[in-house]
């Protein structure tokens, strides 16, 4: 039946793929910063807000030096999938107060989805092992009140901003090693 299939084809210049991913990540970081600022103006936060269902921050900036490409991309993809799910949940269950953040929240969701597809493409172009299919995540409980939805929005956007900031630094560092 012919020769066995060769290894996955790596793109001629993986750095170009990584560049494209950095640009998308940086753009999403700025979008998130601006949307978080808008949220703080509309619904001022009383201190920091946390949400137990959000991923913990992947890495401190100081520990970036020890990172390896497969680990970074796998972890980043998992965390961003979680944030995508939380943004979808926020738009669906966040209550009428958060409707004032549309269409920006919808744009953020679309760009987050696009970045996730870009990461998937990058992983296949770099011939990295594909992560197993994601197990079905337990559904997120609706916020207990309108203010609960607002607190969740602060936590989600704050966490996403930190994650994307880490991601930009990590991706730029990894680019130098390719």
């Amino acid at each position: 039946p012919g020769p066995p299939p060769g290894p996955p084809r790596v793109s001629p210049d993986p750095r170009a793929e990584l560049d494209s991913t950095v640009l998308l990540t940086r753009s999403l970081l700025a979008d998130t910063r601006q949307l978080a600022a808008q949220l703080r103006d509309k619904f001022p936060a009383d201190g920091d807000h946390n949400l137990d269902s959000l991923p913990t921050l992947a890495m401190s900036a100081g520990a970036l030096g020890a990172l390896q490409l497969p680990g970074v991309l796998t972890r980043l993809r998992a965390d961003l999938l979680s944030y995508l799910r939380h943004v979808q949940w926020l738009r669906r269950a966040g209550g009428s107060s958060l409707k004032t953040l549309e269409p920006e929240l919808g744009t953020l969701q679309a760009r987050l989805d696009r970045l996730l597809r870009r990461l998937q493409l990058l992983m296949s172009r770099l011939a990295l092992p594909q992560p197993p299919p994601d197990p079905p995540a337990p559904p997120l409980a609706p916020p207990s009140s309108a203010w609960g939805g607002i607190r969740a929005a602060h936590a989600i956007l704050g966490g996403l901003h930190l994650t994307l900031d880490w991601a930009v630094r990590g991706l730029l560092l990894l680019k130098t090693r390719l």
Epitope: L23, R26, A37
Partner: antibody, heavy 120, light 108 residues
Amino acid sequence: EVQLVESGGGLVQPGGSLRLSCAASGFTFSSFGMHWVRQAPGKGLEWVAYITPGSNTIYYADTVKGRFTISRDNAKNSLYLQMNSLRAEDTAVYYCAREYSSYDEGFAYWGQGTLVTVSS
Amino acid sequence: EIVLTQSPATLSLSPGERATLSCSVSDLIPSQYLHWYQQKPGQAPRLLIYRTSNRASGIPARFSGSGSGTDFTLTISSLEPEDFAVYYCQQGVDVPFTFGQGTKLEIK
């Protein structure tokens, strides 16, 4: 027509304080983030600070952090920059600038500037 | 901090000639966060081109912008006497927002 008019500049001794104002007209002031940008004599542009429409997010350049405070009064259509512990290197023309659209953080419209001179 | 480096520092040309000004960015930035400003002596800067290639209101068609990633360009297709000024590029993707050091466009 968008208009931004700065005032409050002048001569101040090192270590002294000054408060700059920017009077805005021709647009809904409470809908736009505002910046202060400065330009030392014969030099380039340096961003100083940014404040969102509702004042709940503020960013500063490292060179002024802890010494300068940006604030606004939407009822008076006014932007302010309180400058403390002034240094010779703060000598510059200070411009206020309005962002292009809400929360985009750009520099679409500029005032004519007010000169701050820090010297003994 | 993202550093913007403009070249050349000074450009000497005659009216009617084409001007090409460069802005090199220390990090990759999305094109929607790169802007150009014009400043004439004794005046405030004014927005010229926003998001790499969009002319601001009232800016003549002879001004155009292009570029991506780390390399951006402002082009003036045929210089008019009023175009001789200092031009600055600026990035808005990252705080602190930063400007290039400027390119002075002078009459030859």
